[in-house]
């Protein structure tokens, strides 16, 4: 439905508040280093322009595309060259190349200071003094640090952020009310960002077909009572929404997401029995709720898959007529029967089925050739099952911190060239799979664990892509989206790695460690552990554990000392000397 003025269309659809918020998010995700005030100024200018277009869609420049309007606005930033370097070259390009250029310069790990949470009273004062600016600042700070954050979902987070301050700033104990809510929003926000990053990577690196396959599998698990045609329609619409958001088209994305939520709620009866509560909520909550809704119950008496996909004499005929539709049906039928499988496993099974049909439909006796295709699935199913069983046992034995340490050692030995901060961040997140998924019954463990690991390994892939240092990481990240986890699992110790030269500075600690939170202290220790493995990749698990215990004893001793700094200096030297002697550093 063509509109004379796209900007007027979106302004009217979304309303002024959401329009301004989404433009701010878009700009902050593109120009991640720009000060808040500069972005607010740009957003206000765009908003005023949009209002003129709403008043008269034929007004000058109102017919321009959103990319043209937004790109022109971004290119007016005076400090573009000195702040962003070669990104300024994007401004010499025409649309659509200019937008593609901006997208390529999005930085997954921008050099921005860590967000430090002020005192509760300070935050409440700021909230009361200027609520609008306070909330805009939240959107800006999250968007610039997470340039692929799902924009309509960020509006939902901002709504909850506002609600937390509205409630807690008038509570008797403000901190007790507010801090747990902010912690929850922070943790959920990081998880949401990482999940969306995988969707964008899937679309951008592996194409629309890969994303659609993922969506067919996931939606079929979630809505097993829906017909294939219904699932296909939802997949098409969902793909459009995510393509837009990942492409920086945030106004279209938010608008289309609202339309999709509306459609789902109007057609609940043919989609899922679990949507009733979601559909009674306001728009942002509704969309979030639908995205997180539990799987519907499987229809009773689903026939065996073998009839249509193995035993039928028409398998090759049906496949040849419309390959992707037939494979889509296979994926739909398999996924709706298997909420206990991870999406990536279902996609591996579909790929195996496709490969078999490609080979067998060209054979002399196709049926004879593909008759045993389902037998090929068994090892593919058992591999993640066994891995999850082993790792959950290890997690239950060690607890989260020590399980993370085991993974740190494992992954540092696999890919020691990767930067220490990345190894620590990724291994810590991999280790969280234990507390997140191992508590679940068998039927929910695999979808929880393996699909979560896909999200975490994508973090490794996008961080590594910025500064590639390991061919093994590049290979696992680029060869196959669904086989990333098995690829990393299969990596053994990198025997070609030349141990890092010993640097005493890496193992020098100061009294500031004593005042850190438990989490920050763990990160310090885990950083030391990674460095230790990089210096001594041949060290045994037992030796590493023992050296880390010495480190813990050293920190504990010095944090109790009267002159902490002297203790850290003197005892630190002894610790390094002792470890060098013991491990031959």
């Amino acid at each position: 439905d063509a509109h004379k003025s796209e900007v007027a269309h979106r302004f009217k659809d979304l309303g002024e508040e959401n329009f301004k918020a989404l433009v701010l998010i878009a700009f902050a995700q593109y120009l991640q280093q720009c000060p808040f005030e500069d972005h607010v100024k740009l957003v206000n200018e765009v908003t005023e322009f949009a209002k003129t277009c709403v008043a008269d869609e034929s007004a000058e420049n109102c017919d321009k595309s959103l990319h043209t309007l937004f790109g022109d606005k971004l290119c007016t930033v005076a400090t573009l060259r000195e702040t962003y370097g070669e990104m300024a070259d994007c401004c010499a390009k025409q649309e659509p190349e200019r937008n593609e250029c901006f997208l390529q310069h999005k930085d997954d790990n921008p050099n921005l200071p860590r967000l430090v949470r002020p005192e509760v009273d300070v935050m409440c004062t700021a909230f009361h003094d200027n609520e609008e600016t306070f909330l805009k600042k939240y959107l800006y700070e999250i968007a610039r640090r997470h340039p692929y954050f799902y924009a309509p979902e960020l509006l939902f987070f901002a709504k909850r952020y506002k609600a937390a301050f509205t409630e807690c700033c008038q509570a008797a104990d403000k901190a007790a009310c507010l801090l747990p809510k902010l912690d929850e929003l922070r943790d959920e926000g990081k998880a949401s960002s990482a999940k969306q990053r995988l969707k964008c990577a899937s679309l951008q690196k592996f194409g629309e077909r890969a994303f659609k396959a993922w969506a067919v599998a996931r939606l079929s698990q979630r809505f097993p009572k829906a017909e294939f045609a219904e699932v296909s329609k939802l997949v098409t619409d969902l793909t459009k929404v995510h393509t837009e958001c990942c492409h920086g088209d945030l106004l279209e994305c938010a608008d289309d997401r609202a339309d999709l939520a509306k459609y789902i709620c109007e057609n609940q009866d043919s989609i899922s029995s679990k949507l009733k509560e979601c559909c009674e909520k306001p728009l942002l909550e509704k969309s979030h709720c639908i995205a997180e809704v539990e799987n519907d119950e499987m229809p009773a008496d689903l026939p065996s898959l073998a009839a249509d996909f193995v035993e039928s004499k028409d398998v090759c005929k049906n496949y040849a007529e419309a390959k992707d539709v037939f494979l889509g049906m296979f994926l739909y039928e398999y996924a709706r029967r298997h909420p206990d499988y991870s999406v990536v496993l279902l996609l591996r099974l579909a790929k195996t089925y496709e490969t078999t049909l490609e080979k067998c439909c060209a054979a002399a006796d196709p049926h004879e050739c593909y008759a045993k295709v389902f037998d090929e699935f068994k090892p593919l199913v058992e591999e993640p099952q066994n891995l999850i069983k082993q790792n959950c046992e290890l997690f239950e034995q060690l607890g989260e911190y020590k399980f993370q340490n085991a993974l740190l050692v494992r992954y540092t030995k696999k890919v020691p060239q990767v930067s220490t901060p990345t190894l620590v961040e990724v291994s810590r997140n991999l280790g969280k799979v234990g507390s997140k998924c191992c508590k679940h019954p068998e039927a929910k463990r695999m979808p929880c664990a393996e699909d979560y690991l896909s999200v975490v390994l994508n973090q490794l892939c996008v961080l590594h892509e910025k500064t590639p240092v390991s061919d093994r990481v590049t290979k696992c990240c680029t060869e196959s989206l669904v086989n990333r986890r098995p690829c990393f699992s299969a990596l053994e110790v990198d025997e070609t790695y030349v141990p890092k030269e010993f640097n005493a500075e890496t193992f020098t600690f100061h009294a500031d460690i004593c005042t850190l939170s438990e989490k920050e202290r763990q990160i310090k220790k885990q950083t030391a552990l990674v460095e230790l493995v990089k210096h001594k990749p041949k060290a045994t698990k037992e030796q590493l554990k023992a050296v880390m215990d010495d480190f813990a004893a050293f920190v504990e001793k010095c944090c109790k000392a009267d002159d902490k700094e002297t203790c850290f200096a003197e005892e630190g030297k002894k610790l390094v000397a002792a470890s060098q002697a013991a491990l031959g550093l």
Epitope: A546, V547, D549, A582
Partner: nanobody, 124 residues
Framework: QVQLVESGGGLVQAGDSLRLSCAAS????????MGWFRQAPGKELEFVAR????????YYADSVKGRFTASRDNAKNTVYLQMNSLKPEDTAVYYC?????????????????WGQGTQVTVSS
């Protein structure tokens, strides 16, 4: 199961020396730090010394620093506590303990396996 057996305690005069030994059997001795603790009559169990897995790093309680020396011989699965310039206030039952997998290095709760103890009495 780990077994720890202390020996070498006895009755000595103030200013004398004693050497305690602790022989271990069971799980790999060289993988774990060892600790020495003591308990005087009517008092809490008190940290004395910790020696790391390789014998290259030792920590002592302030009350014994400069007088006591911990060492270990991993080939013999034995840890030692050389006690010089003994004082009457060193009188206690001395225990050796093998480090556990968590908890404080200076607290009994951080140690998993314990010997039965050996009595040290220092008369004035």
């Amino acid at each position: 199961q780990v077994q720890l057996v202390e020996s070498g305690g006895g009755l000595v005069q103030a200013g004398d020396s004693l050497r305690l030994s602790c022989a271990a059997s069971g799980r790999t001795f060289s993988d774990y730090a060892m600790g020495w603790f003591r308990q005087a009559p009517g008092k809490e169990l008190e940290f004395v010394a910790r020696i790391n897995w390789s014998g290259t790093l030792t920590y002592y309680a302030d009350s014994v620093k400069g007088r006591f020396t911990a060492s270990r011989d991993n080939a013999k699965n034995t840890v030692y506590l050389q006690m010089n310039s003994l004082k009457p206030e060193d009188t206690a039952v001395y225990y050796c303990a093998q480090r556990g997998d968590s908890g404080s290095n200076y607290d009994p709760s951080g140690y998993r396996y314990w010997g039965q103890g050996t009595q040290v009495t220092v008369s004035s």
